[in-house]
């Protein structure tokens, strides 16, 4: 499909001249950021961004690639080097430590320097590093964590926890030896390490004693509480704050977000991770966009400002399953949340960053025609005389041999939300990829986001922009961060 | 491998504070660019950049990812949307039209708007679009094209040619019907469309009549001249300029580049594409770095400045072969050329851009240990109990079934320069990928390179920065572009 207007050079020349005009008008703000928002697309490498752009565009009856994601509108871009201290290709724990605490750690550890060793409890103490969220709280800001995964998952945990094992969600996941050495599960740290004003996502089961039925799935005890210490962490958290509210469904969330008596809000909408957007029961579970809006309504009451972490956490899960449909629809919802946040905040006082913790071995090739489905087939046949999809994975569970050969695929099969794209190597879970990811920035001090940087730079930019430790002498005026 | 110094949070905090300091010091230059250099890594997507960084670092006995490519040091980064008007995933012809002429075209066409149709000669006339190089020449600058492919290849041809078929290298490749309609081969256009001061790369055979033996391979007639029109285009080109020199080997190139009587230089060092860097005979063929240096020596004599196109064109070829070793060693040589150019020019008056025309379905995953070979195996085994490499392709010629199964691989096999990484889908040639590519910028007006842009924006930034058409009223002072 060739759009007629695009045949004319004037179309492109005018468009580029407008883009140049916009570029020339860009003026770095010299003010501090009152508010900080970091949007984290878990596993959202550049190939995911592009494919999601095309899909989002096509959902609006456009050809696709010429459209804009909300993140595409952010004026500043950098590339972020995601390796962990011990691995070329990192996990979401070590990377969370980097972009939330400003220090690189080791694979599968969270909130700890690289002096800590995976799974070795006795290497925890003394190696804790402090997140920007924690520093923002100390500076009097309100803080929040919003995610589509469990709130105890690696990425959000980087904002509040310190653990040598990212899988220690509840005490049932922590070996007795580690518990005896004083290592706490992540759910316990969520309510005890610091005061978080808004906590929204999944992860109910880690908060309640084993045998506590889940309110949404009371007959499924694999979804019920998992704790072995008998603690009801939600009850403990509620007891800490007079204006605290706990909600577990969408209706309660929307009510609580509009209730001026609510000062602290915990919403846990699934026992584990929240459902994929395509599977979400919109009567029971809020979308990431709705959670983001609820968080902003509460946090923005604080005249000193806020810090908010928003994660599209299941982009990653879709890719691990080699189900690009899931990964890309999650990315679109993530982008919708970015768009909504943009409508509810001002770039005059809010530094917004969008980035990924790492990428995936996900590619988009095969010379498809413009306007063709992102989930469709490449033109022509492969060397084995079979069709192939434009989306493919380097490794993952999509590898199948049928009668000793690669299976054929039809357009209707490849368009299914359940379809697993093929891969070169068969793995139970497709792996992360190690290439640089993009950082998109808008708002005060966004111009500092430039070039190729270590992933740690992200945390430092946020801290500097809001004059938080160790940049309290930031020399940014007016100090929009302290307007009370 | 965990470097001891990286275990200390101070290491990361200091490093990030320095990076912040550098970011704060960045001052957009308000001057025009006297000189323009565009470095084009053909097929150099972000995954290629990262993998090449690690390889280059390891060649210097470092662990890899913590090191810097020359392009990493460029202060400004943007993302470029590479789709062509008719395809989600483009080729090097349509993309060259975009970044060199500022207008998007159709797949496999060059220097033509999208009103032109692939292979339809009669859609050429009236749809030509003019490159920034051509405009620079008209403004009195010297201009040059340097590539490791044949100089008539799609990417360099975007600087000077207009053709509905990128494969029309010599008249022997153009159907008689098209020739009768007046469509010229690319080699003819190279010497006749505009005055190019420096032309360095491969592509000898397209310049000479069929039956002309090649000077380097006189006994191999498949390497000799291909032209059917009896023309010796080199002779014709030499006749146009009093100070013109033609060279075909490294020794002659180095001599010519230092000869003040040489005003125009054409160096064609192979009959077709130049050899991969790993196969190059360094006594006969210059490296891309050496060609870049030679070009800069000649072009920088012009007080009005210059435009230079430098292409690492065989990065793409390595990927098409699914031979990552070739692609990455080509990328390193490309980066070495960028580094050398940086030493020979000043960012006070030279806008340098580094970008790719498109990416490849090339991925780097599998959680390898830091410091392990980029060509090595992932830790653990795949689901089929066989080893697998960290580098893989979505599609390509690396797909092999051995006794109805995926072949096993050893570290020594995967480290071979000839090894083809496995792919999900068997193709004769691995395909391009459609995700956004990076644009790195340094020098006057480099700050305009920001955010997510159409690929066409690159040409417009160059034109604006040097006050070329259509931006002659650029309002940039001092007009460093006209210092004579």
């Amino acid at each position: 499909i060739i759009p007629v207007e695009e045949e004319n050079p004037d179309f492109w020349n005018r468009q580029a001249a407008e883009a140049l005009g916009a570029a020339k008008k860009l003026q770095p703000a010299q003010t501090a950021a009152k508010n900080l928002i970091i949007f984290l697309g878990d596993g959202m490498g550049v190939s995911t961004v592009t494919a999601a752009r095309i899909l989002k565009g096509q959902k609006k009856d456009k050809l696709g690639p010429e459209t804009f994601l909300a993140m595409d509108r952010f004026p500043y871009v950098a590339l972020s080097k995601t390796y962990s201290v011990d691995k070329h290709v990192p996990d979401s724990g070590a990377t969370a430590t980097a972009y939330l605490c400003g220090v690189k750690g080791n694979f599968q550890t969270i909130g700890l320097s690289a002096a800590a060793r995976f799974n070795q409890c006795n290497t925890t103490r003394g190696n804790e590093v402090i997140s920007v969220m924690n520093r923002a709280k100390k500076a009097g800001k309100s803080v929040g964590v919003v995610t589509t995964t469990r709130v105890q998952h690696a990425s959000p945990a980087g904002a509040y926890a310190h653990t040598v094992n990212r899988n220690w969600y509840s005490d049932a996941d922590v070996p007795a030896s580690a518990r005896q050495e004083g290592c706490q599960d992540i759910a316990t740290q969520l309510i005890s390490n610091m005061d978080i004003d808004v906590i929204l996502g999944g992860g109910r089961k880690y908060m309640f004693p084993m045998g506590t039925p889940d309110p949404e799935y009371p007959d499924d005890y694999s979804q019920g509480g998992t704790r072995l210490d008998g603690k009801n962490l939600v009850q403990e958290w509620l007891a800490k704050h007079q204006g605290a509210r706990y909600v577990w469904n969408r209706t309660e969330l929307l009510q609580a977000s509009l209730d001026p008596s609510v000062t602290h809000l915990m919403g846990l909408f699934e026992p584990g991770d929240m459902k994929y957007e395509i599977h979400r029961d919109s009567t029971l579970d809020p979308s990431l966009m709705e959670m983001t809006e609820a968080a902003l309504l509460l946090l923005s009451r604080n005249p000193r400002g806020f810090f908010l972490f928003v994660e599209g956490g299941r982009i990653d899960h879709g890719h691990h399953e080699s189900r690009a449909y899931r990964a890309l629809t999650e990315t679109i919802m993530f982008d919708d949340a970015i768009e909504r946040a943009g409508q509810l905040t001002s770039e005059e006082d809010t530094l917004s960053l969008v980035t990924a913790d790492h990428s995936h071995v996900f590619s988009f090739g095969g010379y498809p025609l413009r306007g063709s489905s992102i989930f469709g087939l490449a033109p022509g046949k492969a060397r084995d005389r079979k069709a192939y999809t434009v989306l493919l994975y380097g490794n993952g569970p999509g590898y199948v041999l049928k009668d000793g050969a690669r299976p054929d695929v039809t357009e209707s099969e490849s368009g299914s939300p359940e379809y697993r794209q093929q891969s070169a190597v068969p793995l139970d879970g497709e792996t992360h990829a190690g290439e640089d990811v993009a950082v998109f920035a808008r708002g005060p001090q966004a111009h500092l986001v430039h070039g190729v940087q270590e992933q740690t730079f992200i945390a430092h930019v946020m801290a500097f922009a809001a004059c938080l430790e160790p940049y309290t002498a930031c020399d940014l005026a007016p100090r929009a961060g302290t307007t009370d | 491998i965990i470097p001891v110094e990286e275990e200390n949070p101070d290491f990361w905090n200091r490093q990030a504070a320095e990076a912040l300091g550098a970011a704060k010091k960045l001052q957009p230059a308000q001057t025009a660019a006297k000189n323009l250099i565009i470095f084009l890594g053909d097929g150099m997507g972000v995954s290629t950049v990262t993998a090449a960084r690690i390889l280059k670092g390891q060649k210097k006995d470092k662990l890899g990812p913590e090191t810097f490519l020359a392009m990493d040091r460029f202060p400004y980064v943007a993302l470029s949307k590479t789709y062509s008007v008719d395809k989600h995933v483009p080729d090097s012809g349509a993309t060259a039209t975009a970044y060199l002429c500022g207008v998007k075209g159709n797949f496999q066409t060059i220097g033509l708007s999208a009103a032109a149709r692939f292979n339809q000669c009669n859609t050429t006339r009236g749809n030509e679009v003019i490159s920034v190089m051509n405009r620079a020449k008209k403004a009195g600058k010297s201009v040059g094209v340097v590539t490791t492919t044949r100089v008539q290849h799609a990417s360099p041809a975007g600087a000077y040619a207009h053709t509905v078929n990128r494969n029309w290298y010599s008249d022997a490749d153009v159907p008689a019907s098209a020739r009768q309609e007046g469509c010229q081969d690319i080699a003819t256009q190279l010497i006749s469309n505009m005055d190019i001061d420096v032309i360095l790369g491969g592509g000898r055979k397209y310049m000479f009549p069929m039956g002309t033996p090649d000077p380097e391979y006189p006994d191999d007639y498949s390497q000799g001249g291909t032209r059917l029109d009896g023309k010796n285009l080199v002779q014709e080109w030499l006749a146009k300029h009093q100070g013109a020199r033609y060279v075909w080997n490294r020794t002659e190139l180095l001599q010519a580049s230092l000869d003040p009587s040489v005003t125009h230089l054409m160096g064609l060092f192979e009959p077709g594409d130049m050899k991969y860097e790993i196969h190059r005979d360094s006594t006969l063929d210059p490296s891309l770095m050496e060609m870049t240096e030679a070009a800069l020596l000649l072009l920088s004599r012009n007080p009005r400045g210059f435009f230079l196109f430098v292409e690492g064109g065989r990065i793409d070829h390595g990927h098409h072969e699914s031979r990552a070793y070739r692609a990455l060693t080509e990328t390193i040589m490309f980066d070495d050329a960028i580094e050398r150019a940086g030493q020979l020019t000043s960012e006070e008056d030279t806008l340098s851009l580094v970008t790719a025309d498109h990416s490849h379905v090339f991925s780097f995953g599998g959680y390898p240990l830091r410091g392990s070979s980029i060509f090595g195996l992932a830790p653990g085994k795949a689901r089929d109990r066989k080893a697998y490499t960290v580098l893989l392709y979505g599609n390509g010629p690396g797909y092999v079934l051995k006794d109805g199964a995926r072949p096993d691989v050893t570290e020594s096999e995967s480290g071979s320069p000839e090894y083809r990484q496995q792919s999900a889908v068997p193709l004769d040639g691995e395909t391009h990928a459609g995700e956004d590519v990076a644009v790195f910028a340094r020098g006057p007006q480099a700050h305009l390179v920001h955010g997510v842009q159409e690929q066409t924006f690159i040409a417009h930034v160059m034109a604006f920065a040097a006050c070329l058409e259509p931006y002659t009223a650029c309002d940039l002072a001092p007009r460093a572009g006209t210092t004579d």
Epitope: A172, D173, P175, P209, G211, Y221, S222, Q223, G230 | -
Partner: antibody, heavy 120, light 111 residues
Framework: QQQLEESGGDLVQPGASLTLTCTAS?????????MCWGRQAPGKGLEWIGC???????TYYANWAKGRFTISKTSSTTVTLQMTSLTAADTATYFC?????????????WGPGTLVTVSS | IVMTQTPSSKSVPVGDTVTINCQAS????????LAWYQQKPGQSPKLLIY???ILDSGVPSRFKGSGSGTQFTLTISDVVCDDAATYYC????????????FGGGTELVVK
């Protein structure tokens, strides 16, 4: 069909050691399962020995069993019970059992049992 | 934790209702970690009820569990011949040592 089977039961001398193996078929243990061992002396009631929680390989034992009995996960489908310093009082049918997913105190899948006889 | 079952044996006619009691020496974990098992001679135990009142899949609704904390009851209504077996309660105190224990068992004879 999901099944458990114990193996390794034998006639041994007092003071000897013995390792019993519990093998799953039709499923593999996930992190929400507790794998437990119990025993039943001839004509007597059931006695709990201990469990292993698959999520973190934590083990929990009855007071009387601690030190002499060790439960280990050896693969995603096998669990072992190592017993040392056996006495006649340890003569029993030994059962392995899998918990309801997420509920460590309820065992809904049992093996048929294997007989251990300690006698000189 | 010590689980005490009463009675140790019970004889009931077909169609009657029978109640078996189980007392824990201290509160079970979360006040609900109590399970009931049925064992027939020469067979492995079979789970009937867990978390004090939840019927395991495939168990007839004639079986009912109740109670909380330290006092629990198993009620079998409309007893049938096939219900003849020994019934055990099992309590879980937590991840402390000696975390679980079975009761002594109640033998049910159906007349």
């Amino acid at each position: 069909q999901q099944q458990l089977e114990e193996s390794g039961g034998d006639l041994v001398q007092p003071g000897a050691s013995l390792t019993l193996t519990c093998t799953a078929s039709g499923f593999s243990f996930n992190s929400n399962y507790w794998m437990c061992w119990g025993r039943q002396a001839p004509g007597k009631g059931l006695e709990w020995i201990g469990c292993i929680l698959f999520g973190n390989t934590d083990t929990y034992y009855a007071n009387w069993a601690k030190g002499r009995f060790t439960i280990s996960k050896t693969s995603s489908t096998t669990v072992t019970l190592q017993m040392t310093s056996l006495t006649a009082a340890d003569t029993a049918t030994y059962f392995c059992a899998r918990s309801v997913s997420g509920v460590g105190s309820a065992w809904n899948l049992w093996g048929p049992g294997t007989l251990v006889t300690v006698s000189s | 934790i010590v689980m005490t079952q009463t009675p140790s044996s019970k004889s009931v006619p077909v169609g009657d209702t029978v109640t078996i009691n189980c007392q824990a020496s201290e509160s079970v974990y979360n006040n609900n970690h109590l399970a009931w098992y049925q064992q027939k001679p020469g067979q492995s135990p079979k789970l009937l009820i867990y978390l004090a009142s939840i019927l395991d899949s495939g168990v007839p609704s004639r079986f009912k569990g109740s109670g909380s904390g330290t006092q629990f009851t198993l009620t079998i209504s409309d007893v049938v011949c096939d219900d003849a077996a020994t019934y055990y309660c099992a309590g879980y105190k937590g991840i402390t040592i000696d975390g679980s224990a079975f009761g002594g068992g109640t033998e049910l004879v159906v007349k």
